[in-house]
């Protein structure tokens, strides 16, 4: 079954390569187990950047290798992606799955365009 997912259209990463955005889903029921996946769509590729499963009210548990962290509050997930560089600029899509209890629901956001600007190197001091 389909579900609406909202996320910001554009986010600018910090000078330290950190980008945060909120992924909000319209839960049709009272889900107790939720899975959130961040997809990057760019360079003619689709990459699962990170994924987390969480029980409502608990911390997000990301798969190992994750460059993401996050917290949840109700039907909102606050996601942070770290270690970004200019070449990581792209469309980051939030995918939400309500795993339990049945029925299963799937929602995919329209994506957040994350812009990353590499900081200028500090000039040499005399």
């Amino acid at each position: 079954k389909a579900m609406h997912v909202a996320q910001p259209a554009v986010v600018l990463a910090s000078s330290r390569g950190i980008a945060s955005f909120v992924c909000e889903y319209a839960s049709p029921g009272k889900a107790t187990e939720v899975r959130v996946t961040v997809l990057r769509q760019a360079d003619s590729q689709v990459t699962e950047v990170c994924a987390a499963t969480y029980m409502m009210g608990n911390e997000l548990t990301f798969l190992d290798d994750s460059i993401c962290t996050g917290t949840s509050s109700g039907n909102q997930v606050n996601l942070t992606i770290q270690g970004l560089r200019a070449m990581d600029t792209g469309l980051y899509i939030c995918k939400v799955e309500l795993m339990y209890p049945p029925p299963y629901y799937l929602g995919i956001g329209n994506g957040t365009q994350i812009y990353v600007i590499d900081p200028e190197p500090c000039p040499d001091s005399d």
């Epitope: 990459t47 950047v49 990170c50 190992d64 290798d65 970004l84 070449m87």
Partner: nanobody
Framework: EVQLVESGGGVVQTGGSLRLSCAAS????????MGWFRQAPGEDREFVAA????????AYADSVLGRFTISRDNANEMAYLQMNSLNPEDTAVYYC??????????????????WGQGTQVTVSS
């Protein structure tokens, strides 16, 4: 480095399926991000798919999304590429590759320092 040997290539008709296998040895397999690449005659080598060290995260080229599935079996040090709905444009030599790096946003650009010898896939119309 890890040693990689591909198998499973062959000739198949349009719409058919193949499953490629990549056997690894020499180093701890679970420390490597695994990728599949392909190279058609006269073309550059191109990224097909990649999978994280745990197997939980994957990446695909748009051209194979929904048709190909990458997977891995860390216990048996194997990586796989299930290829369905094959078409003549999929004809190429397919290479398995290993990168000793964690996951990120652009696995197609990881430094893959170990490569197999390749296995030929030919899709006839």
């Amino acid at each position: 480095e890890v040693q990689l040997v591909e198998s499973g290539g062959g000739v198949v008709q349009t719409g058919g399926s193949l499953r490629l296998s990549c056997a690894a040895s020499g180093r701890t397999f679970s420390m490597y991000t695994m990728g599949w690449f392909r190279q058609a005659p006269g073309e550059d080598r191109e990224f097909v798919a990649a999978i994280s060290r745990s197997g939980g995260l994957k990446a695909y080229a748009d051209s194979v999304l929904g048709r190909f599935t990458i997977s891995r079996d860390n216990a048996n040090e194997m990586a796989y590429l299930q290829m369905n709905s094959l078409n003549p444009e999929d004809t190429a030599v397919y290479y398995c590759a290993a990168a000793p790096v964690p996951w990120g946003t652009r696995p197609s650009h990881f430094t893959y320092d170990s490569w197999g010898q390749g296995t030929q896939v030919t899709v006839s119309s």
